[in-house]
């Protein structure tokens, strides 16, 4: 190899000034003995390279590129040979921004999948390979003082969420959690929560169905329907609150809320609808008194309210 | 401290009905499901019933469902088990139990033995 | 209903041993699976619960482990008042049911 670069900083800011030096050997020998050393970025060449000869008789071109607003390039030294640019040595360079801090840090217990699944907003764009890393650790108390560290979780590329498997967790117990983003220019961290893996339990909703009429039961007053909901089995035993949720099918009505209704309630009457309508359903949970995390709505029941009744006229007849 | 006192076991004859009562302290008894587990002499551990916090949920096992009423009354802090139609196989000592939030018993009662016999 | 079925149903082992007890589950239970300690003439006493956690007061030689179908209970170093009969239990959904126990012994 004739020729060698060696720059400043590979990575830099993006805009900051980079500094490059490009040596040629004294022993190729087959080159003019007072080269010019040329400089380009990517496909541009770039003036203002110093050129010097030094004392063991190598060649040094020494360029300051003032502002690298590329966010990826190549820098290569080059010589003239005959009528074409032959390349001694080039590198690679990047500019970019160091993370900023990771930000909206939220987690959520699936007891489901058994599991903390963590998210956060990534911030801008760095234009470098950045790492995030979930962080956590198990503690007595507030999260002042630091217990058992837990594994790192580290997402898939492209990612802002991570998932801590329950043997890592202590349900019960304060926990320490932050995501660290880091690339060549630097790390940042976001601000810590500290949480019991139950307080964000978020349940999956009961299934809602029609209640099966009972031969010694009245039917359905007109505009009215009788519901009933089967919780779901592996949160039963979590005290709940939950709502429903309902709309006319038809039309453009949005939705009308009812609740907060008990879990234990399992069998409800709701009235003041359409009679004769057909209207969609749902219902959702959330762990109460305790905290947690609304479910998501159940998938839809539909169902059809009663005719109104027939009014009777009554008819005087005169003799 | 959180306690729990059964009470009402004792000698029946197939077909008779005993009432067990749990009495709790040390917790906030409204807020919890209770629960009944069984143990027949020499043999393993199985769960009767248990209860929702404030009564609405009462599932049973197969083998009690028609017979067995679990209830409680939170403003005494006690839970019951009404047993009717009782047979020889439900000769065991009877635990009450508090539930955690995933369904675990803890803490137990010392136990009250029934005995189904002629 | 989901059955539980617990491995071996008894074992002899000396204190310092390192004990494994094992549970299945007929159908997946995620980790809604609680290990008790019952000594005779006592109540049963919760030892951990949703599969690994340790239940306040209890020695950190007890640790579960397990998800799905298959659960572990284990006894780092076996102490002389660890003797007892040990049961798994499924929380996922009712009827909430037992595996048969495992009896520890004094070889």
């Known amino acids: 190899e004739c020729g060698h670069i060696s720059v400043s900083a590979p990575i830099v800011h993006l805009g900051d000034p980079i500094t490059a030096s490009c040596i040629i050997k004294q022993n190729c020998s087959h080159l003019d003995p007072e080269p010019q050393i040329l400089w380009r970025l990517g496909a541009e060449l770039q003036p203002g390279g110093r050129q010097q000869r030094l004392s063991d008789g190598t060649q040094e071109s020494i360029i300051t590129l003032p502002h690298l607003n590329h966010t990826q390039a190549f820098l290569s030294c080059a010589l003239n040979w005959g009528n074409s640019l032959q390349i001694l040595d080039q590198v690679e360079l990047r500019a970019g921004y160091p993370p900023a801090i990771p930000h909206n840090l939220s987690c959520l217990m699936n007891l489901t999948t058994s599991s903390l699944i963590c998210q956060w907003e990534p911030g801008p764009e760095t234009h470098l390979p950045t790492s995030f890393t979930l962080k956590s650790f198990k503690s007595r108390g507030n999260c002042q003082t630091q217990g058992d560290s837990i594994l790192d979780c580290v997402p898939k590329d492209g990612q802002s969420h991570c998932s801590i498997p329950a043997k890592h967790l202590l349900l019960y117990q304060n926990m320490g959690i932050w995501v660290q983003a880091e690339n060549a220019l630097g790390t940042s961290m976001s601000p810590q929560l500290c949480l019991d893996p139950m307080d964000v339990v978020k349940l999956e909703p009961p299934m809602l169905r029609t209640m099966d009429p009972s031969p010694e039961a009245a039917p359905p007053q007109a505009g009215c329907l009788q519901l009933s909901w089967e919780p779901w089995q592996p949160g039963l035993h979590i005290n709940q609150k939950c709502e429903l949720r309902h709309k006319p099918q038809r039309g453009e009505a949005s939705w009308a809320l009812v609740g907060p209704l008990p879990l234990e309630a399992l069998q409800y009457e709701l009235c003041g609808l359409l009679p004769a309508t057909a209207y969609t359903l749902q219902i959702r949970c959330i762990r109460w008194p305790l905290p947690g995390h609304w479910s998501d709505w159940s998938p839809s029941l539909e169902l059809r309210t009663t005719e109104r009744a027939p009014t009777h006229h009554h008819h005087h007849h005169h003799h | 401290e959180v306690q729990l006192l059964e009470s009402g076991g004792g000698l029946v004859q197939p077909g008779g009905s005993l009432r067990l009562s749990c009495a709790a302290s040390?917790?906030?008894?409204?807020?919890?499901?209770m629960g009944w587990v069984r143990q027949a002499p020499g043999k393993g551990l199985e769960w009767v019933s248990s209860?929702?916090?404030?009564?609405?949920?009462?599932p049973y096992a197969d083998s009690v469902k028609g017979r067995f009423t679990i209830s409680r009354d939170n403003s005494k802090n006690t839970l019951y088990l009404q047993m009717n139609s009782l047979r020889a196989e439900d000769t065991a000592v009877y635990y009450c139990?508090?539930?955690?939030?995933?369904?675990?018993?803890?803490?137990w009662g010392q136990g009250t033995l029934v005995t189904v016999s002629s | 209903d989901i059955q539980m079925t617990q491995s071996p149903s008894s074992l002899s082992a000396s204190v310092g041993d390192r004990v494994t007890i094992t549970c299945r589950a007929s159908?997946?239970?995620?980790?809604?699976l609680n290990w008790y300690q019952q000594k005779p003439g006592k109540a049963p006493k919760l030892l951990i619960y949703?599969?690994?956690n340790l239940q306040n007061g209890v020695p950190s030689r007890f640790s579960g482990s397990g998800s799905g179908t298959d659960f572990t209970l284990t006894i780092s170093s076996l102490q002389p008042e660890d003797f007892a009969t040990y049961y798994c239990?499924?929380?996922?959904?009712?009827?909430?049911?037992f595996g048969g126990g495992t009896k520890v012994e004094i070889k």
């Open positions: 949703y599969a690994s």
């Open positions: 159908q997946g239970i995620s980790s809604y």
């Open positions: 040390g917790f906030t008894f409204s807020l919890y499901w």
């Open positions: 139990a508090k539930l955690g939030e995933l369904g675990w018993f803890d803490p």
């Open positions: 209860i929702s916090s404030s009564g609405g949920v009462t």
């Open positions: 239990q499924q929380s996922y959904s009712t009827p909430l049911t």
